[in-house]
């Protein structure tokens, strides 16, 4: 009797219900809401995230522009149809019929319409921009000392390979880290950067969905980053198709 | 896969001292917050102290206060258990344990996500 066997628990997903019933009595794992198996090793989709979300109990500037196709999530929380490798379906749609189409991180990228609503592929979010207000501090914090510690955090906590967060900016108080993943360069088990830019947001707004009670412990040479503001920018691989009246809205 | 490796584990009489280490062999070691868990004979896993990974912070349950210290080095990816006045009922297999990186822990197990195998400690009377 080991003290690993009494964590039968997911790391990386709280929103799980596990058992020791896998093969060998090995701990098994699977996701509110859609009772899907997930790999606790790694992150779990965003799509499954929401799904068991929804589930629950109800409770020289240096800075980047976004591009003018560039995505913000203002839809809010919606109960997401996922796919059997837990992505969301290029199309959802709600209790009242209404669909739209979104891009792989579930952001709606077109105009809402009916069930006849057409959506061919799901779009890849290739580019996404998180940007950040940091709480006041005595000074500003060294930009190479945040650099790395945030390249870290990405590596170690969310186990996003390196090569995709392609840059972080710095002028006090904005931080914007960049992602960059495109279809090509994503291999088989690479963490998803839309999946990473979820973790890291819900951590920011203190509901870390890794095991335990604790939360994001974020400190660049000791000194605490506390964020008070997330902007969280998305660009896809084909632009968004709006019609122009919500864009004169 | 992390590796956590307990030693220092021995008999000792009552009153006397050990020093138990865990060393951390995954790379995510000065990140995570590091704690000490124990198991006597037919009882229920216990927390007995927790650290952050600046070592600034540090976490006793009553029983092992003002007897115990915990202390990391992060060159060494080592997290330390002093263990002073020791007490008959402080026998226990004890376990080191590392949260996931960059999470806040405390003495509640369920904060930490890899587990040593444990070291034995034995006090007699």
């Known amino acids: 009797h080991t003290a690993a066997q009494d964590n039968c628990t997911c790391p990386t997903n709280k929103m799980t219900v596990c058992s020791p019933d896998g093969p060998g009595g090995r701990c098994q794992c699977r996701a509110l809401g859609s009772g899907m198996a997930v790999d606790c090793s790694t992150l779990t989709s965003k799509c499954l995230l929401l799904k068991a979300r929804m589930s629950a109990p109800k409770n020289a500037r240096t800075l980047v522009r976004p591009s003018e196709h560039a995505l913000v999530d203002n839809d809010g929380l919606y109960d997401p149809d996922c796919d059997p490798e837990g992505r969301f379906k290029a199309r959802q749609c709600n209790q009242t019929s209404v669909c739209w189409c979104v891009n792989s991180v579930g952001v709606r990228r077109t105009d809402k319409g009916d069930l006849s609503l057409r959506c061919d592929e799901l779009v890849r979010t290739h580019h996404i921009l998180i940007d950040l207000r940091h709480r006041p501090t005595a000074g500003a914090f060294n930009h190479s000392d945040l650099d790395a510690e945030l390249r870290r955090l990405f590596r170690e906590r969310y186990r996003l390979h390196p090569k995709f967060v392609a840059a972080v900016h710095y002028e006090q108080p904005t931080i914007q880290i960049e992602l960059r993943q495109n279809t090509s360069q994503k291999a088989a088990g690479d963490v998803d950067i839309g999946d990473a830019a979820y973790y890291f947001e819900r951590d920011i707004k203190g509901e870390s969905l890794f095991q335990g009670r604790g939360g994001l412990d974020l400190r660049v040479r000791g000194e605490p980053l506390q964020v008070e503001r997330t902007l969280i920018y998305y660009l896809d691989e084909i632009p968004p198709k709006f019609s122009m009246k919500r864009l004169t809205a | 896969q992390v590796q956590l490796q307990e030693s220092g584990g021995g008999s000792v009489q009552a009153g006397g001292s050990l020093r138990l280490s865990c060393v951390d062999s995954?790379?995510?070691?000065?990140?995570?917050?590091m704690g000490w868990f124990r198991r006597a004979p037919g009882k229920e896993r216990e927390g007995v102290s927790v650290i952050s990974p600046y070592g600034d912070s540090t976490y006793y349950a009553d029983s092992v206060k003002d007897r115990f210290t915990i202390s990391r080095d992060n060159a060494k990816n080592t997290v330390y258990l002093q263990m002073n006045s020791l007490k008959p009922e402080d026998t226990a297999m004890y376990y080191c344990a590392a949260s996931w990186p960059y999470q806040t822990a405390s003495l509640d197990a369920m904060d930490f996500t890899d587990w040593g195998q444990g070291t034995q400690v034995t006090v007699s009377s």
């Open positions: 995954g790379s995510t070691y000065s990140r995570r917050y």
